[in-house]
């Protein structure tokens, strides 16, 4: 049939295997009048070969690093050889086979490398060679180091590149390595083809020999530089150099500065270029770099720390222009007033800004001077001699001297006398109702108003209200906040609302001031308020315990096997009944109240695993919602697929008579799961009476070779049963038809005359 | 051994047509073609045509595909070349000649035939 | 059609001295398989003709080998290395690439 194997001239491509004995034609020709024959032209290499009637094949094994591509021409020839159709391009791509081994193109090498070089930096590289496809496993490379000597401490100092053969060092290499402890390594260097994942990869090896240098490239000492330096700039402040001379330096800041105080010379040396100043930036860390003369750098970057040493250039400055602080009528003797937190640049902890306060001056000085005063070192204002009178003086401004041990400032506190705190908040309303909300209320909704009045002073500490939510809001999903010029709560929503776990809550407000109150009295009922809040459910679908199930089994597992289960919940506790949806082999079936999943048929892991449906639950009663899971099956393979032949192998030929017995090769397959070492068939022959004409004897374990006993046979067609079984568990056996004929040739192919074109051999022996 | 035999020479008034026969001998006839050329007194060569008797597949040289025609019979193993409507410059020596197939040239020739038109 | 010059058209020679025959194509007559399509044959006087030179440069059986052919894939040559009696009569080129097959005039050699 046309197809395949044969068809009309037209431009083609093969694919074949290097390395194999011709075990088929490659393809027929189909001539139209009046071409009677056919020619073919190109790069032949004597090993292709067209017949008179247009039956293209290779008469020995082709070799893919001879030649990668045939590219031949067809045409065919009328009677008297004038091209009447084509010629044709006809490629033959020759698929690689790994047939070469790997060779490192020196069996030693030599290199060095410096301590402390950067790790992963190649210092050496290893190169092989291998004839085979680069572009296939064959031909890709996999180097890797068999051992080091010395290896200390059981540590890799040195690694290479799988891939390029680039030997540099490993993080520990590039620490640890010390030409004073160490100074010579050697190496062995193995490199596979099949990119090192097959056991039979073939495999070369090379020794290489490694010795360790000084490294000077090393960080200096961190240095310190005393801020607004007058002396003249720049300032060498450091150095680094470079283990060869021809370095080229420079310096990178990490932190992008808008000023970049430092810069290095070609020697290495590192200088300040201008004063520094501490309260601008009291430490600098940069990177020396040394550069080749292309720009690529050398190794790593040298971290380079300078900090600034402070001097005190900086007086002590006021929190602000005016600092307010309120004190009740009639407060206590010793009772803290407010704190003046004064500020100095200099330097943290250290004498430069460690300051001290002192009173200068009270205004007024009713009923008399001296009625307050400030702790030396924490600023702090207390009442010092008597409880004040608001009718009497209603304010009081002090100036504070704030110094360091260089620098004075003067600050500036006003102290007002304000009533005394004798009145509570109370609450306009003791209870606020009760509020309905559903459950999926937006975060940040004002649900509530509440009002409490105090009756104090207005403006003050002492008539300002906050409010707290004291009882029934364990989970802080409400807050109040108040507005300072009405001192009205906004009640709000700050996590959501949940009706599963909190219906109904019995909310408490308290209202309080900022101020404490005066000796004697207490909050009372009147500053406490309740309001109800019923939380309405909003109907939630049934939750997954997982987005994906999985499960695992024998692919042979009996029908009505459980092969996994799912699990859901619903949020308002409805029950749920599940489903499965996409099961388009119709192999499961699942329990509609448990979400057990069992096999209603026969299940087949060469069909496809994993299996993959898709789990629906769904409420019963309510409003039906629901929710969709995945549950992925996967399938173990069971040894239930007998062996075949890998091709169609119609077509076998040997030329009659047999000058000497013949042999050809086939392929067995099977579509079982064969891990690792693939399948290991074992071949026989089919039946008894064809032990005297026929042998089979195991390639490996997918190919075989059926040879002729002898040479008498008929020019007829024989019917070759061969029997190939898997070794599997159980053991599998399938029989199968070799068709092979005996036909008298010419050149290597079947004769027929011309114009007969039922029954085309494809494959001469 | 191969041999190419034509029939005798032909005297023929114009109009008229001539059939020249070329029997072959010593080999199988249907492997190879046959050719007709024709040599007219003092003049070169000129192909008119060939036949392939294994299927009969005939070509011709465009000048005599008109008059020309070229027949065989495998049973006889013979070709035969007519020409119809024969003119006085039709006068010549009319020879056939195997085409060797796979080597692709005129191994064997027949003793050509000579056609005379004359009024 | 491809149009086969020959030269000379005449050649006297005397015998036991070499002879060369030209023949020109107005067309490659190389295909890509390397053949040549040229074919050289001799009509001795009274005969009908009989091949000398098949493919170029290929001396067909029975063809003595004072005898030879080259060329490139439009300038042709047949070479006789010694001119012997026998070898009288009209040399011709064919082309046989494609049709119609063409000849070239013939080279009449005769004995000086």
């Known amino acids: 049939q046309e197809g395949k194997f044969s068809g009309p001239l037209k431009p083609m491509t093969f694919s074949i295997y290097e390395g194999q004995e011709p075990s088929q034609i490659i393809f027929q020709f189909k001539a139209n009048p009046p071409a009677v024959t056919f020619e073919l032209t190109g790069e032949t290499d004597n090993i292709f070969v067209i017949e008179r009637e247009g039956l293209l094949y290779y008469n020995r094994a082709l070799d893919r690093e001879t030649r990668s591509t045939h590219n031949l021409q067809v045409a065919a020839l009328d009677a008297n050889g004038i091209i009447v159709e084509g010629p044709v391009p006809i490629t033959i791509k020759v698929k690689d086979i790994n047939d070469n081994r790997p060779t490192f193109l020196q069996s030693k090498y030599e290199g060095s490398v410096r301590q402390n070089s950067r790790p992963g930096k190649p210092f050496l590289y290893v190169n092989a060679t291998d004839l085979d496809d680069p572009a296939t496993p064959n031909g890709q490379l996999y180097y890797q180091i068999v051992i080091q000597l010395p290896m200390i401490n059981n540590v890799m100092y040195f690694q290479i590149n799988n891939k390029t053969g680039a030997i540099s060092l490993t993080r520990e290499g590039s620490q640890e390595l010390n030409p004073a402890k160490n100074p010579s390594y050697n190496l062995v260097i193995s490199v596979k083809d099949m990119g090192g994942q097959s056991e039979n990869s073939f495999s070369d090896t090379t020794s290489v020999d490694i010795i360790v240098t000084e490294n000077i490239w090393k960080a200096p000492k961190p240095v310190e530089m005393v801020e607004n330096s007058t002396d003249p700039h720049p300032i060498k402040i450091t150095q680094v150099r470079w283990n060869d001379p021809g370095a080229q330096y420079s310096l990178v800041d990490k932190e992008k500065l808008p000023r970049f105080p430092f810069s290095i010379d070609q020697e290495g040396d590192i200088y300040v270029t201008q004063p520094l100043d501490r309260e601008e930036k009291d430490a600098y860390v940069f990177y020396a770099v040394a550069k080749d003369e292309y720009g690529k750098p050398l190794s790593y970057p040298l971290e380079i720390h300078v900090k600034v040493k402070d001097i005190n250039d900086n007086p002590p400055t006021c929190p602000s222009p005016v600092t307010v602080f309120e004190v009740q009528e009639n407060e206590r003797l010793g009772n803290s007033i407010g704190t003046l937190t004064a500020h100095d640049r200099d330097e943290e902890n250290t004498a430069n800004s460690f300051l001290n306060y002192r009173i200068v001056e009270q205004t007024p000085k009713l009923p008399m001077d001296g009625l307050f005063l400030i702790q030396t070192y924490a600023g702090m204002l207390q009442l010092a001699k008597q409880s004040l009178k608001k009718q009497d003086t209603p304010q009081y401004n002090l100036t504070i001297e704030v110094s360091d041990k260089d620098f004075k400032t003067l600050c500036f506190v006003q102290i007002n006398v304000i009533d005394i705190n004798d009145q509570i908040p109370i609450f306009e309303k003791s209870d606020y109702g009760n509020l309905t909300l559903a459950e999926d209320t937006n975060i940040g909704s004002t649900i509530l108003t509440i009002q409490a009045t105090d009756a104090d002073e207005p403006f003050t500490g002492s008539s300002k209200i906050l409010y707290h939510i004291i009882k029934g809001d364990s989970e802080g999903r409400l807050g109040v906040d108040t507005d300072p010029h009405t001192n009205t709560g906004y009640v709000i929503i700050k996590k959501p609302l949940d009706f599963e776990t909190a219906a109904v809550s019995n909310i408490v407000f308290k209202a309080e001031n900022p101020e404490p109150l005066v000796f004697g009295v207490k909050y009372n009922a009147s500053s406490f308020a309740k309001f109800t809040l019923i939380v309405t459910d909003v109907n939630e679908a049934p939750q997954f315990s997982q987005h994906v199930f999985q499960a695992k089994v024998s692919e042979d597992v009996a029908i009505g096997t459980k092969v996994g289960n799912v699990t859901a919940k619903d949020p308002e506790g409805l029950d749920i009944s599940y489903s499965l949806r996409g099961d388009t082999r119709g192999w499961l079936k699942i329990d509609h109240v448990t979400g057990e999943i069992f096999s209603v048929a026969p299940l087949d892991r060469e069909a496809g695993s994993p299996y993959r449906v898709q789990v629906v639950a769904t409420e019963v009663g309510g409003s039906s919602l629901s929710s969709v899971s995945e549950f992925h099956l996967i399938l173990m393979d069971v040894n239930d697929n007998p062996p075949r032949l890998a091709k169609d192998y119609t077509g076998l030929f040997f030329c009659h008579p047999l000058s000497a017995p013949g042999s050809l090769i086939f392929e067995a397959t099977d579509d079982d799961q064969h891990l690792f070492r693939g399948p290991h068939f074992t071949f026989s022959l089919g039946s008894g009476s064809l032990q005297n004409d026929w042998e089979v004897s195991k390639i490996n374990g997918t190919h075989a070779r059926l040879s002729t006993r002898h040479t008498e046979f008929e020019e007829r067609e024989y019917v070759v049963l061969i029997r190939i079984n898997d070794g599997g568990r159980p053991p599998l056996e399938g029989i199968v038809s070799l068709p092979v004929t005996f036909c008298s040739c010419v050149e290597g192919s079947c004769f027929r005359p011309a114009g007969h074109q039922t029954g085309i051999p494809t494959v001469g022996m | 051994q191969v041999q190419l035999v034509q029939s005798g020479a032909e005297v023929k008034k114009p109009g008229a047509s001539v059939k020249v026969s070329c029997k072959a001998s010593?080999?199988?006839?249907?492997?190879?073609?046959i050719h007709w050329m024709r040599q007219r007194p003092g003049q070169g060569l000129e192909w008119i045509g060939y036949?392939?008797?294994?299927?009969?597949?005939?070509k011709y040289n465009e000048k005599f595909k008109d008059r020309a025609t070229l027949t065989a019979d495998t049973s006889t193993s013979t070709a035969y070349m007519e020409l119809r409507s024969l003119r006085s410059d039709d006068t010549a020596v009319y020879y056939c000649?195997?085409?060797?197939?796979?080597?692709?040239?005129?191994?064997?020739w027949g003793q050509g035939t000579t056609v005379t038109v004359s009024s | 059609d491809i149009v086969m010059t020959q030269s000379p058209l005449s050649l006297p020679v005397t015998p036991g001295e070499p002879a060369s025959i030209s023949c020109r194509s107005s067309?490659?007559?190389?295909?890509?398989?390397?053949?040549?399509?040229l074919y050289w044959f001799l009509q001795k006087p009274g005969q009908s003709p009989q091949v000398l030179i098949y493919?170029?440069?290929n001396l067909a059986s029975g063809v003595p080998d004072r005898f030879s052919g080259s060329g490139s894939g439009t300038d042709f040559t047949l070479k006789i290395s010694r001119v012997e009696a026998e070898d009288v009569g009209v040399y011709y080129c064919?082309?046989?690439?494609?049709?119609?097959?063409?000849f070239g005039q013939g080279t009449k050699l005769e004995i000086k």
């Open positions: 000649a195997r085409f060797y197939y796979g080597y692709w040239y005129f191994d064997v």
């Open positions: 010593g080999y199988t006839f249907t492997d190879h073609t």
């Open positions: 036949i392939y008797p294994r299927d009969g597949y005939t």
């Open positions: 067309k490659s007559l190389l295909r890509s398989n390397g053949n040549t399509y």
């Open positions: 493919r170029m440069s």
């Open positions: 064919m082309q046989h690439l494609e049709y119609p097959f063409t």
